[in-house]
Amino acid sequence: SCNTATCVTHRLAGLLSRSGGVVKDNFVPTNVGSEAF
C-alpha cells in the first residue's frame, strides 16, 4: 500500500470522516506512520 506523505494524509482524512472525528488528538498526518493503517 502507498506510504507517501500524501497517501497517508488522504487515508487519515478518510478514517477521520468514517469515525466522525472521534480519534486521539495527536492522530494527525505528521504523527501517524503508514503502519497505523
Partner: antibody
Framework: EVQLVQSGAEVKKPGASVKVSCKAS????????MNWVRQAPGQCLEWIGD????????NYNQKFKGRATLTVDKSASTAYMELSSLRSEDTAVYYC????????????WGQGTTVTVSS | DIQMTQSPSSLSASVGDRVTITCKAS??????VAWFQQKPGKAPKSLIY???YRYSGVPSRFSGSGSGTDFTLTISSLQPEDFATYYC?????????FGCGTKVEIK
C-alpha cells in the same frame, strides 16, 4: 481561513543561493506535510520535495538532492526552501502546498515566488 | 521515476461541450492520482484526489476516474471559467510527478 503566504520575487546570479519562505496560518502548521513544487516558463510542474514540520523529516526529488534544502521554523509556522548553485534553468515560479484536513479538507497552495537566475 | 503522459496537449472546445482529458502512468499507481486546474499567472487549484474524489467546493461537472495506469478527467459541460490548463499528478511513489498539462482553449 487557511493561507500560505510566500516571500517576494528574487533575482539571483548564477552560482548563488536563494531561500524562499512560506508562512502558514489558519491551521496547525505541524500537523501537515509541506510540499514544494516549481514551474519553469513553458515547462511541466516539478515536485522538489516535502517536509514533516513536526519532526523535520524530508523527502527529496533526486534531481534536487544536494542542492535543495527544506527546513521549517515551527515557532513562526514558516517553511523554507533553499536552492543552491543556481543556474539559468532554475528560473521558475516556486510554490509551497499542503493538504489540510482540519479545518477544511483541501489542498492549499501558496501564491508562488518567482526566482530569476540571470548574470 | 514514474512518467505521467497527458493527452491531448491542447484542445479547443465551446461552452457546454463535454471535455475529456486522459493521463497515462508509466507504471501502476493504484488510484493515487490528483488533478489540478491552473489559470495564467495563478497557482494550481486542486480539483480531484484519489483519482475520483472531488474536493469540497469543486463543481460537480468535474469528475475523475481510473486506476492502475489509465486516468481520465471529464468536464461534463464546459463553462467560461473552465478555460485553463489541467494537470494530473501521481503521488503513489516518490518523487511525485506531473503530466505536462492539457490546455483547454475557446473554439
Amino acid at each position: 481561513e487557511v493561507q500560505l503566504v510566500q516571500s517576494g520575487a528574487e533575482v539571483k546570479k548564477p552560482g548563488a543561493s536563494v531561500k524562499v519562505s512560506c508562512k502558514a496560518s489558519g491551521y496547525t502548521f505541524t500537523d501537515y506535510y509541506m510540499n514544494w513544487v516549481r514551474q519553469a516558463p513553458g515547462q511541466c510542474l516539478e515536485w522538489i520535495g516535502d517536509i514533516n514540520p513536526n519532526q523535520g523529516g524530508t523527502n527529496y526529488n533526486q534531481k534536487f538532492k544536494g542542492r535543495a534544502t527544506l527546513t521549517v521554523d515551527k515557532s513562526a509556522s514558516t517553511a523554507y526552501m533553499e536552492l543552491s548553485s543556481l543556474r539559468s534553468e532554475d528560473t521558475a515560479v516556486y510554490y509551497c502546498a499542503s493538504i489540510i484536513i482540519v479545518p477544511n479538507y483541501f489542498d492549499y497552495w501558496g501564491q508562488g515566488t518567482t526566482v530569476t537566475v540571470s548574470s | 521515476d514514474i512518467q505521467m503522459t497527458q493527452s491531448p496537449s491542447s484542445l479547443s472546445a465551446s461552452v457546454g461541450d463535454r471535455v475529456t482529458i486522459t493521463c497515462k502512468a508509466s507504471q501502476n499507481v493504484d488510484t493515487n492520482v490528483a488533478w489540478f486546474q491552473q489559470k495564467p499567472g495563478k497557482a494550481p487549484k486542486s480539483l480531484i484526489y484519489s483519482a475520483s474524489y472531488r474536493y469540497s467546493g469543486v463543481p460537480s461537472r468535474f469528475s475523475g476516474s481510473g486506476s492502475g495506469t489509465d486516468f481520465t478527467l471529464t468536464i461534463s459541460s464546459l463553462q467560461p471559467e473552465d478555460f485553463a490548463t489541467y494537470y494530473c499528478q501521481q503521488y503513489n511513489n516518490y518523487p511525485y510527478t506531473f503530466g505536462c498539462g492539457t490546455k483547454v482553449e475557446i473554439k
